[in-house]
């Protein structure tokens, strides 16, 4: 049964931030995992995609990610399907909106002493709390004839008088963040002597070295005064400009012009209007310098014909917010069509081969333009140029099987031999074009071969049978030198294979016939009792009709096999004394004797003064030391055979005689009688 180890759980998420719905599955067989949103399968996009079994969100979207997500695991073999618990996001967001007049119905109906209600159209989840401002100053509830209903996001002025005139804005904040009104409301209740806003400066974003204009106008009777201030309260006039505002001009209508704007000019500008009576009106506007960052690189994409795919272009950070559009072959992608742009996404529906190519995402604002290319390849199913053919390959020679296909992208070719994947090694090689080379064909290469050519769009396969044309050869080739033991029975085998079963016969190299006690039985040369005369050169001949004949020459030697006359014994010697290890062997040809001590051959030419090997084969070690202890092996060998025998050598300290021991008391173990070696 399919078991969910980790289930997706409902969670809080922030608009535009990352999120992950976890899902982990355990099942006896392979399962494929997919996700549902409100019962419909979730398609991968760059914004929302499967990450293993889990669903990853690069940027949560309150519209596209609202609903119920479910992780589904399906065993395609059994058809068993398991669904996880439902999970959804509690998406926190905030979105700016305007300040609008709720009551009365139109501005024309606003009169002194009437009730005025303004509504703040900032929305969000969780519901934000609202703060109202008049001319940039926060308004607190219950002061100066106004009430703030946070729940209704309304500001009510009752009754409204000239002192309430001004620019009303609102801000709202919640767990997600903060937003301020996108469009403010100017309330004008006439008291002719009060300064009244006619035109309020707006925040501006300009490119470096461009010009910026702030408009500001007040009206009153008599006319009000107007003054501009920058950031640090520095007044700006045409007579006294601060050093960093040399290129500022204040016009008679109150507008402020800044030319060749530089970074140091960015900041808050205040326009202050003062009537004969009433408070000064301070209006603020910010000058921002336009900027645009670089765009991240796109990975090349491979899509399948007939599918629907999307590529998201995340706009670079910039001010103002850069606009984004996609182009292909120099033409903007349309809003509708089989290939279209929607929001920041390039969408290719029912992909065709002709859709392949370079698509460019452009982003632009006042600061400039950025672009990034994405290379889209439309994968096609491979087609055959040359299928593998049933083939007869010669043993011992290289063999080739073709598998030539074409597709986009270039297909990958794998070969199977008897349903087992062929991994490239010293015998097999797959060329770039898909051809399989068998470097040296062997008999057991005669079997079924299958090649599979694949792209992301699909795969094709074909198989072929290989028949190996066997060489005429000895199996195995007879040893060229062989020994037979004198006066014993002996056999010398010779076998061969070929395309047809070969006939095998032996003959003496000099052409003379085999003696009667020697028989040739289906390739096996049999000596009933080996004599000295049986030594010599013999030839094994294998032949068949189509392939002719082959010959193997064997030199037979008659020998008396080695036996040991004297073998070394287990020996214990006192330190500093001499050890003698005896060894004598006999045989024909006369054997040579070698010694091996402590796992290495003792080379007679490099033994040094302490060791010596006698003519008869015995080994003598003078002035023995503890490190001479160990196994010593006597190896006797001739051209026909080799034999060895071994014995241990123990080197011990000479005991100090005790009172109780008589001078003739025997040692506690068998000692070899040796002479003490005196140093001079």
């Amino acid at each position: 049964a399919i078991v969910f180890i980790k289930q997706p759980s409902s969670q809080d998420a922030l608009q535009g931030r990352r999120a992950l719905l976890r899902c982990e599955v355990e099942a006896p067989g392979p399962v494929h995992v997919y996700w549902l949103l409100d019962g419909a399968p979730v398609q991968d996009t760059e914004r929302r995609f499967a990450q293993g079994s889990s669903l990853s969100f690069a940027a949560v979207d309150r519209l596209q990610d609202s609903g119920t997500f479910q992780c589904v695991a399906r065993d395609d073999v059994t058809g068993e399907e398991a669904r996880s618990a439902n999970a959804s996001f509690n998406i926190k967001w905030i979105e700016a909106g305007p300040v609008v007049l709720k009551h009365p119905a139109s501005e024309a109906e606003i009169q002194p002493q009437t009730q005025v209600t303004l509504r703040c159209h900032i929305d969000g989840h969780p519901r934000p709390t609202y703060q109202w401002f008049r001319d940039g100053t926060p308004l607190s509830d219950g002061q100066s004839n106004h009430t703030v209903s946070s729940k209704e996001r309304n500001l009510t002025l009752r009754p409204a008088g000239p002192e309430h005139s001004g620019l009303y804005s609102c801000c709202a904040h919640s767990a997600f963040g903060q937003a301020c009104s996108s469009q403010n409301f100017t309330l004008s209740i006439a008291d002719e002597s009060f300064a009244r806003v006619v035109l309020a400066p707006q925040d501006v974003v300009v490119a470096r070295y461009e010009e910026a204009m702030f408009h500001c106008q007040f009206s009153a009777q008599p006319p009000p005064s107007l003054q501009w201030l920058f950031e640090d309260e520095t007044p700006i006039t045409n007579r006294s400009r601060p050093p960093h505002l040399r290129r500022a001009t204040v016009f008679a209508n109150g507008s402020l012009l800044l030319t060749q704007v530089r970074p140091r000019n960015a900041g808050i500008y205040r326009c202050i209007g003062q009537g004969q009576r009433g408070p000064p009106i301070i209006l603020e506007a910010t000058l921002h310098l336009a900027e645009i960052e670089d765009m991240p690189l796109f990975e090349p994409r491979v899509f399948t014909a007939g599918s629907e795919e999307r590529v998201t272009c995340l706009p670079p950070k910039g001010l103002p917010e850069p606009s984004v559009w996609w182009e292909h072959a120099g033409v903007r992608l349309p809003t509708h069509g089989r290939v279209y742009q929607k929001g920041h996404e390039l969408v290719l529906a029912n992909i065709a081969e002709s859709d392949a190519g370079v698509y460019t995402c452009h982003a632009a604002n006042l600061a400039g333009q950025r672009r990034q290319d994405v290379n889209i390849t439309v994968a096609t199913v491979p087609s055959w140029l040359k299928k593998p053919q049933d083939s007869q390959l010669e043993e011992g020679k290289p063999g080739y099987l073709d598998c030539l296909t074409q597709a986009t992208p270039k297909p990958t070719v794998v070969w199977y031999r008897n349903q087992m994947l062929i991994s490239e090694d010293s015998r097999f090689e797959v060329f770039k074009n898909g051809t399989l080379r068998i470097n040296s064909v062997e008999v057991y290469d005669g079997t079924w071969y299958r090649c599979m050519s694949s792209t992301p769009a699909g795969s094709i396969e074909a198989q072929a049978r290989v028949q190996v044309l066997e060489k005429l050869k000895f199996t195995p080739p007879p040893q060229p030198q062989q020994c037979m033991e004198f006066d014993k029975e002996a056999t010398v085998p010779c076998s061969a294979t070929g395309r047809e079963k070969p006939t095998i016969k032996w003959e003496r190299a000099d052409g003379s016939s085999l003696p009667e006690w020697v028989t040739d039985n289906a390739g096996t040369l049999h000596f009933a009792r080996v004599t000295r005369d049986d030594a010599g050169n013999y030839t094994c001949i294998a032949s068949n009709g189509p392939q002719g004949q082959i010959r193997a020459h064997v030199q037979l030697t008659v020998a008396v096999f080695i036996t040991f006359k004297v073998e070394p014994e287990r020996t214990t010697v006192y330190q500093g004394h001499t050890a003698l290890l005896q060894c004598e062997a006999q045989g024909d040809p006369k054997p040579l004797i070698q010694w091996k001590g402590k796992d290495r051959i003792l080379d007679p030419t490099k033994l040094g003064p302490r060791m010596h090997i006698f003519q008869n084969g015995s080994l003598v070690i003078h002035d023995v030391a503890p490190e001479d202890s160990g196994r010593y092996t006597c190896i006797a060998g001739n051209s026909c055979n080799i034999k060895h025998t071994e014995a241990p050598l123990y080197v011990v300290d000479k005991p100090v005689p005790e009172e109780s021991e008589g001078p003739g008391s025997p040692p506690p173990y068998k000692m070899i009688q040796t002479h003490h070696h005196h140093h001079h």
Epitope: Q64, G330, R332, P334, T335, H336
Partner: antibody, heavy 120, light 107 residues
């Protein structure tokens, strides 16, 4: 078959808000690729595109009217609503809703239109 | 915004004639153009999309061509029922914009 029908007031006063409803059948706005446009045509004049809402609630507005327009959908009722604030006599026109199929073309099926007159 | 300039504003032709209406875009719109027919007192009907694709059920005498900035609607073998105003629409970018229309009269 696909049908669309516009409904709303035939007469509105200047400064008032116009609310128009497009009720459709023969397709669903929950189907991927479906959208509804609003288009208007003043008497004897050319067509003017106003707004578009897609199946996934993606909305597009004509920038020249953006501050006055709001488009919403009620998928379960097969309805799309357009509201236009601060109406003016120059807004007198026949208002059409039309279906868009994102993979084909904008406005492949249209309603018969509703004439809205703005007058005091 | 992309401007669509349609010409002529009106034309008169006889049954059986071949009629050509053109639309010029203020910038490259690829093939993102549709043509609509609006009979008197009726809603517009889609004729051509993607500059040259005839919409389902539209008679073969209507054909569209062009790409980039210059587009043409051709009516061959004019019929009495073709009396209507014809509009082009670009959908390369938002806002979608229409041509001013061409009023076609039958002599």
């Amino acid at each position: 078959q696909v049908t669309l029908k516009e409904s709303g007031p035939t007469l509105v006063k200047p400064t008032q808000t116009l609310t128009l409803t497009c009720t459709f059948s023969g397709f669903s706005l929950s189907t991927s690729g479906m959208g509804i446009n609003w288009i208007r045509q003043p008497p004897g004049k050319a067509l003017e595109w106003l707004a578009l809402i897609w199946w996934d609630d993606d909305k597009y507005y004509n920038p020249s009217l953006k501050n006055r327009l709001t488009i919403t959908k009620d998928t379960s009722k097969n309805q799309v609503v357009l509201t236009m604030t601060n109406m003016d006599p120059v807004d007198t026109a026949t208002y059409y809703c039309a279906r868009s199929l994102i993979t084909t073309a904008p406005s492949d099926y249209w309603g018969q239109g509703t004439l809205v007159t703005v007058s005091s | 915004d992309i401007q669509m300039t349609q010409s002529p504003s009106s034309l008169s032709a006889s049954v059986g004639d071949r009629v050509t209406i053109t639309c010029k875009a203020s910038q490259n719109v690829g093939t993102a153009i549709t043509w609509y027919q609006q009979r008197p007192g009726k809603a517009p009907k889609l004729l051509i999309y993607s500059a040259s694709n005839r919409y389902t059920g539209v008679p073969s005498r209507f054909s569209g061509s062009g790409s980039g900035t210059d587009f043409t609607l051709t009516i061959s073998n004019l019929q009495p029922e073709d009396l209507a105003t014809y509009f082009c629409l670009q959908y390369s970018d938002y806002p979608l914009t229409f041509g001013q229309g061409t009023r076609l009269e039958i002599k």
